[in-house]
Interface confidence: low
């Protein structure tokens, strides 16, 4: 009969290396009598016999992990006990080897030049993978601005335009290599003016071209501002080449001005702008001109656009703070009242008011307005709008107009120069010239009235009230 013998582990457990999803086996050969009871632990926790992830065979001497997971690594021990002597134990480590895996790959990034960019690349693997980066087709070289962090992420300080391109990270260990997909780093650059417009000192009526060149990513747009408002006249030509936009503003110079070039581009929800300004001054813009009542310029408004001669120079009165806006506002205010007048009167009145408020202008050394010829003014008053004029005078006498309306633009016909005295000293109304066949004599034309088929000028939404403060005789 065999003598009882305490258990002895004849083949101690060793470190086992296993790949994920492969089989790993620990062998614990025991000699003893009677046969021992063998139990297994992982990290000091008992492995249950019915755990389907494990197989325990050969009377418990063989532990097999059927499909290794990365969470299986740890210390495995077998404990043998047969009641004779003490229990014996042997332990070994399971090292789960794992090919590199990129768990947080990089993503496309848009970044503004000069900021810091971080492209993530988090990896798993055993041995711990080393991470490197590829830009385009070449390995990325680290420098004091570009670093691969311990996490595997790529950090770029003070991002430059040259950093733009395609990147991928590479995770490598002894078992293999993993590549991320290609991602794009786009570097956006704030709008910047490369070439500012130059200031000019030119003669009245010259053409000047202001040039402004800007760069940025995305390519900026360029807008022009004249004395704080959008440029309303002049022509703009633009060309774009290799992220550079070139804008040329051609102007017909009739007054001094400050012209500002504004380059704008968009970064997400934000905009970046760059500005540069130039002055255009007029040579011989002498003291007499500065002290004069106004200046000549092209009409740029809307109300009288259809009435005034195209591209004609008109007089702007500098006693107003902003002459062009002020005069346009006056005509605007006057316009609606004309809706109530007869179709015969309206176009003539429009022609009279527009030509009176925006008088033809002779540039000269001192800009001089040319008033309407008296004969044309009387024709409107006594022929085309006789009824309306009488009604208005009646209202005025009964106090129906408030005295504050005297600023409205109705000329006093008697004070206007006669075309018979000096035909070059006053302005004719082209609309009335068009109807000459119906008007045979000036100025006393009470008998001969124009036919009522005068075409309406374009309708307007503006308003008009006539002032009684001017004498109509």
């Amino acid at each position: 009969e065999k003598l009882p013998k305490a258990p002895v582990i004849t083949t101690p457990l060793e470190t086992v290396d296993a790949l994920v999803e492969e089989v790993a086996t620990f062998m614990c050969a025991v000699e003893s009598y009677p046969q021992p009871e063998i139990s297994w632990t992982r990290n000091k926790i008992l492995i249950k016999l019915f755990d389907t992830r494990y197989s325990i065979r050969e009377n418990g001497q063989l532990l097999t992990i059927l499909s290794v997971e990365d969470s299986d690594d740890g210390i495995y021990c077998c404990i043998a006990n047969n009641g004779v002597g003490g229990a014996v134990e042997s332990c070994g480590a399971l090292q789960v080897k794992m090919k590199p895996k990129i768990t947080r790959p990089p993503i496309n990034v848009k970044i503004i030049e000069g900021l810091k960019a971080v492209l993530p690349c988090t990896t798993m693997g055993n041995p711990k993978p080393s991470v490197s980066w590829i830009k385009g087709d070449n390995a990325l070289r680290e420098n004091s601005r570009i670093a691969v962090l311990e996490s595997g992420s790529l950090r770029i300080h003070n991002v430059q335009k040259e950093d733009a391109g395609q990147y991928r990270c590479v995770a490598k260990n002894s078992l293999g290599t993993a590549y991320s997909k290609l991602v794009k780093l786009e570097v956006e650059v704030f709008a910047r003016i490369l070439r500012a417009p130059e200031s000019h000192n030119v003669t009245f009526g010259s053409f000047v071209t202001l040039r402004c060149t800007a760069i940025g990513i995305p390519v900026p747009t360029i807008s022009w501002i004249e004395n704080g408002n959008a440029v309303s006249s002049g022509s703009i030509q633009e060309s774009v080449k290799d992220r550079v936009i070139d804008s040329r503003l051609q102007l017909f110079i009739t007054k001094p001005g400050l012209y500002t070039c504004i380059a704008t581009n968009k970064h997400g929800e934000k905009f970046s702008t760059a500005k540069a300004a130039a002055t255009v001054s007029i040579a011989e813009w002498s003291k007499s001109q500065k002290d004069s009542q106004g200046y000549c310029a092209q009409y740029r408004g809307e109300v009288c656009d259809a009435v005034l001669a195209k591209d004609a120079l008109v007089f702007f009165n500098t006693s107003y703070r902003d002459p062009e806006d002020a005069q346009e506002l006056l005509i605007h205010t006057a316009w609606n009242e004309l809706k109530a007048v007869s179709p015969l009167c309206r176009p003539a009145a429009e022609a009279l008011l527009c030509n009176h408020l925006f008088q033809e202008c002779s540039p000269g050394v001192v800009p001089t307005p040319m008033p309407i010829c008296r004969e044309y003014c009387l024709a409107v008053k006594e022929l085309f709008c006789a009824k309306e004029w009488q009604a208005m005078e009646g209202k005025a006498h009964r106090g129906l107009y408030r005295s504050g309306m005297h600023l409205l633009p109705v000329p006093e016909c008697s004070k206007l120069p006669s075309m018979h005295r000096d035909p070059t000293a006053c302005t004719r109304l082209p609309y009335l010239d068009y109807k000459k066949e119906n008007i045979t004599t000036f100025p006393s034309i009470t008998s001969s009235r124009p036919s009522a088929d005068i075409p309406n000028l374009p309708a307007s939404t503006s308003s008009f009230a006539v002032s009684p403060a001017y004498s109509m005789t």
Partner: antibody
Framework: QVQLVQSGAEVKKPGASVKVSCKAS????????MHWVRQAPGQGLEWMGW????????NYAQKFQGRVTMTRDTSISTAYMELSRLRSDDTAVYSC???????????WGQGTMVTVSS | SYVLTQPPSVSVAPGQTARITCGGN??????VHWYQQKPGQAPVLVVY???DRPSGIPERFSGSNSGNTATLTISRVEAGDEADYYC???????????FGTGTKVTVL
């Protein structure tokens, strides 16, 4: 708190080598470049080079190329600068410096005086 | 290699403003950092990235950078501001760091 602590002063003979250490604490040593800067008596600051403690990558100023070696031991968060073939004009205070998140040097070691004299 | 030039010395009366310049070719396109160094002490960063101040640095220290010159301005100068001041940039073409020649600021 964040600090860089350097090894003590050294006296060396011409032709010898010196190795200065710089122990970092209070921040992630491997996360930021370590630079070495020297200053000769009465002179200005002179950048010598950098080491990336994570990868071990280095970049040396042209003047020191071939004579300087920068290394690190991440397990003890320490960077080293070794200068060989010492000359008397290498007498200077050698400092380590790092920029925590900016490209300037916002933390400095206290400096190590190295005297080269026969 | 890239060179940064500073005036050797600047003198200023207490309460006045000191301006230290740092000249370099197209320095305006680079980020400039400024350090203060008192005798026997390690340098201290006073301005970085042209005009940013690290925490703990008084608002009296300010910086600007454009064209070929960067400037460190110390307003309302105090006796404790007496020190050497160095500018520094990162030279992207050589991937090296460059210090200026240094300026000694004396408070009269």
């Amino acid at each position: 708190q964040v600090q860089l602590v350097q090894s003590g002063a050294e006296v060396k003979k011409p032709g010898a080598s010196v190795k200065v250490s710089c122990k970092a604490s209070g921040y992630t040593f491997t996360g930021y470049y370590m630079h070495w800067v020297r200053q000769a008596p009465g002179q200005g600051l002179e950048w010598m080079g950098w080491i990336n403690p994570h990868s071990g990558g280095t970049n040396y100023a042209q003047k020191f190329q071939g004579r300087v070696t920068m290394t690190r031991d991440t397990s003890i968060s320490t960077a080293y600068m070794e200068l060989s073939r010492l000359r008397s004009d290498d007498t200077a205070v050698y400092s380590c410096a790092s920029g925590l998140g900016i490209s300037a040097f916002d933390i400095w070691g206290q400096g190590t005086m190295v005297t080269v004299s026969s | 290699s890239y060179v940064l030039t500073q005036p050797p010395s600047v003198s200023v009366a207490p309460g006045q403003t000191a301006r230290i310049t740092c000249g370099g070719n197209n320095i305006g396109s680079k980020s400039v950092h400024w350090y203060q160094q008192k005798p026997g002490q390690a340098p201290v960063l006073v301005v970085y990235d042209d005009s940013d101040r690290p925490s703990g640095i008084p608002e009296r220290f300010s910086g600007s950078n454009s064209g070929n010159t960067a400037t460190l301005t110390i307003s309302r100068v105090e006796a404790g501001d007496e020190a050497d001041y160095y500018c520094q940039v990162w030279d992207s073409s050589s991937d090296h760091y460059v210090f200026g020649t240094g300026t000694k600021v004396t408070v009269l």
